[in-house]
Every structure is written in structure tokens, then in C-alpha cells.
């Protein structure tokens, strides 16, 4: 912490400008009025202050606003944002998307820091839900953002926001997240025609139940193997060989290369070998002809 010292004669800052870069830390502390700094925060970013000098400026703002900075100051923090701790940010009330964008811009190209995560959390909580514009902004800066949210947090995402989601935004989502996102996507995209609908819904299918996969198999969608491999195992297991063949279309040949991996491996074990043979792919491991297939899930449901 900088010691309180009197400002030397003639050094009192009248405005925030380049001359301040020549001030020592103690001179900045003594000669820059915190209220002046707050009203001219937009100038700070254009001045090449050292990290030590930025520490002093932050200290002055902290003293002026012990309960947290107002949004008028936050919006113009620029690189001073990098000096903020998550504890500082928790005191803020950020409501403007422009403020959020301005601060995300400062961190652009870097991993999501604890500061940014806290900022986003404060912003989303302040808005009450993850609306489309916010989601648009966040996924533009952090494509993996959506998949960093818990299923509980995703539950507050309105279906209209799903339009902002690109396939790459879902790359790291797990089945529990897709569980929540898939029904929202169905609501959002249902008025599109068949082929357009499939293009949009494809990335979300890791949350689809068996019945929807059966329905898709009747629509000549030609699902690629990468999408098929991301489907829920429990949703794939009840599909018949004919249904998988229709679902994958020309991509069905790819099953051979994936026969040792889930969900293909587990699905093969549930099919009659005779049925698998009709694909002509040499898939092995099905139930031999003449064996009785017991549906244990049905037995459990009855007991």
C-alpha cells in the first residue's frame, strides 16, 4: 500500500493524460484525485501505464468505491480489469451487455480466467436468465462456454437462445448437459423443414431419447458416424438393425470401424447376428441364431 504523502507543487493532475506516465507511484497516489480518475476512466486505456502504476489507480478507485464500482466506471476499466480479483468483481452490479463485451475484449484470446468467470456469473445472475444476446456474446468469446455450465444452470436458458448456438459450442458438452439442451433445441427448431431441422438439431442429439431416434430414422437424414457415436448408449440400444441402417443411410458402412467402441459395441451385443449379417459389413458379436432374447428392462419394470 502506498504511503500518504502531499502532492508536490504544480503536480496536481487536472486531467488524466500522458504526462502521468512520468509520475512515480507515490506521486500518482498523492496527485490524482479519485473522482477525476473515475470520470475519465475511458482515457486510462490509451495511456501506457506500467502495472505498478495501474495498481495505484486501482487502489484509488477501491478507496472511492469500497462497496464496488459503479457501471459507468466498470465499462471503461479496460486493462485495469486484469488487476481485479474475483472478490472485487463480486461487488459489482453489471447489467449492460456493452460493459460485458468491453471487459471480455480485454481478455480476448486467453483462457477464461477466474475474473471473467465471476464477471459472467454476476452478469447472468443479474439478468435472471441466459438470454440470446448474452449467449451470442459469450459463445463468440468462449466457444466452450455453454458446456462449462452445469445442467442446473442450463435449465434457465430459454429455448429462443438456442438459435445462437453453433455446433462447435457443444463439442465439450456431456450427456447430462445435452439432456437439458436437447428439448430446448427441439422447441426452438421444430418449425423448420426436415433437412434444415436435422442440420440444426444434429449437434444436440446426444440428449435425444430412443423414440426420437426412431422417428429420425424414418426421415432419410443420413446421420454421420461422428454424431452417431455421441448418442446416448441407452437411447441407441433399443434401435433395430433396420432402424440404424435407415438412420445412417450411406454412412452405415462406418459402423465396422467403430464396432469396438461405445455405443456401437454395446448395440451390436443386443442385435441378432442374422440381422447384423444383412448389413454385409462383417459385424461380429451379435446374439447367435436360435438364442432367446430376454428384455431384462421390461422384466425390471414389471417386478
Amino acid at each position: 500500500e502506498v504511503e500518504k504523502t502531499a502532492c508536490p507543487s504544480g503536480k496536481k493532475a487536472r486531467e488524466i493524460d500522458e504526462s502521468l506516465i512520468f509520475y512515480k507511484k507515490w506521486e500518482l497516489e498523492a496527485c490524482v484525485d479519485a473522482a477525476l480518475l473515475a470520470t475519465q476512466m475511458d482515457r486510462v486505456n490509451a495511456i501506457p501505464f506500467t502495472y505498478e502504476q495501474l495498481d495505484v489507480l486501482k487502489h484509488k478507485l477501491d478507496e472511492l468505491y469500497p462497496q464496488g464500482y459503479p457501471e459507468s466506471v466498470i465499462q471503461h476499466l479496460g486493462y485495469l480489469f486484469l488487476k481485479m480479483s474475483p472478490e472485487d468483481i463480486r461487488k459489482w452490479n453489471v447489467t449492460s451487455l456493452e460493459t460485458l463485451k468491453a471487459l471480455l475484449e480485454v481478455n480476448k484470446g486467453h483462457e477464461m480466467s477466474p475474473q471473467v468467470a465471476t464477471l459472467i456469473d454476476r452478469f447472468v445472475k443479474g439478468r435472471g436468465q441466459l438470454d440470446k444476446d448474452t449467449l451470442d456474446t459469450l459463445t463468440a468469446f468462449y466457444p466452450g462456454y455453454l458446456c462449462s455450465l452445469s445442467p442446473e444452470e442450463l435449465s434457465s436458458v430459454p429455448p429462443s437462445s438456442i438459435w445462437a448456438v453453433r455446433p462447435q459450442d457443444l463439442d465439450t458438452c456431456d450427456p447430462r448437459q445435452l439432456d437439458v439442451l436437447y428439448p430446448k433445441a427441439r422447441l426452438a427448431f421444430q418449425n423448420m423443414n426436415g433437412s434444415e431441422y436435422f442440420v440444426k438439431i444434429q449437434s444436440f442429439l446426444g440428449g435425444a431419447p430412443t423414440e426420437d431416434l426412431k422417428a429420425l430414422s424414418q426421415q432419410n437424414v443420413s446421420m454421420d458416424l461422428a454424431t452417431f457415436m455421441k448418442l446416448r448408449t441407452d437411447a441407441v440400444l433399443p434401435l433395430t438393425v433396420a432402424e440404424v441402417q435407415k438412420l445412417l443411410g450411406p454412412h452405415v458402412e462406418g459402423l465396422k470401424a467403430e464396432e469396438r467402441h461405445r455405443p456401437v459395441r454395446d448395440w451390436i451385443l443386443r442385435q441378432r447376428q442374422d440381422d447384423l449379417d444383412t448389413l454385409g459389413l462383417g459385424l461380429q458379436g451379435g446374439i447367435p441364431n436360435g438364442y432367446l432374447v430376454l428384455d431384462l428392462s421390461m422384466q425390471e419394470a414389471l417386478s
Epitope: 445442467p151 439432456d179 427441439r186 431419447p209 426420437d212 422417428a215 446416448r232 441407452d234
Partner: nanobody
């Protein structure tokens, strides 16, 4: 077209358990993607309480998680909410919600009309 109707006591004493049932008519709830509960305290916004998904996974609002249980009885076409150790802060209009259309070409979200639950001694 599904119709949802919440039922349960309108008045609950502090520290007791709030129990609500949502009865669905006009279709089978087996065709739903999820069954959930949402509430709106007087003068405040909507607050998601929790949902059970078709996959069997259950998700609860973290701030309520230790007190909430949601269950589904597809044979009765009902799902229910239990919220334990209630306080005056749990006074709200409670809505049940579901989204049907599993295996169908269209899907829709349906809400009950809501039931006011007051927590008071």
C-alpha cells in the same frame, strides 16, 4: 393438448414439508422430455425449482437442492414436488411444467395454471 393441474394445501406451517401434485390430462406423460416445477414469489421473477428428465436424470436448483424431491408416477399420469423445512421465503405461486412430443414431429411446453402456497403459522 395436455392440461396440467397443481393440487395441494394452500397453507403450510414453517418447518413443515410442502407437498404438491401435478395431474396431467389429455395425453400420457410418458411422452414427455421432462417434468418440472417453477415458482414465483410475490413481486418477484420466476425461479426454477427442478426437473426430472426422460433419461432419468434429476436436476435441482442448487439453492434448494438439500430440501427438494421431485418424483414421477407415469401410471397415474402425475408428478410431484416435496419441499422440506419451509419458511416464509417459500411463499409463492407454484407451477408444474412439462414438454411432450417424444417420438413425435412436434413438441410443446405446457404449464399448469399455478397454485398459491403460503407459509405461515
Amino acid at each position: 393438448q395436455l392440461q396440467l393441474q397443481e393440487s395441494g394445501p394452500g397453507l403450510v406451517k414453517p418447518s413443515e414439508t410442502l407437498s404438491l401434485t401435478c395431474t396431467v390430462s389429455g395425453g400420457s406423460i410418458s411422452n414427455s422430455y421432462y417434468w418440472g416445477w417453477i415458482r414465483q414469489p410475490p413481486g418477484k421473477g420466476l425461479e426454477w425449482i427442478g426437473s426430472i428428465y426422460h433419461s432419468g436424470n434429476t436436476y435441482y436448483n442448487p439453492s434448494l437442492k438439500s430440501r427438494v424431491t421431485i418424483s414421477v408416477d407415469t401410471s397415474k399420469n402425475q408428478f410431484s414436488l416435496k419441499l422440506s423445512s419451509v419458511t416464509a421465503a417459500d411463499t409463492a405461486v407454484y407451477y408444474c411444467v412439462t414438454q411432450d412430443g417424444v417420438g413425435a414431429t412436434t413438441t410443446e411446453e405446457y404449464w399448469g395454471q399455478g397454485t398459491l402456497v403460503t407459509v405461515s403459522s
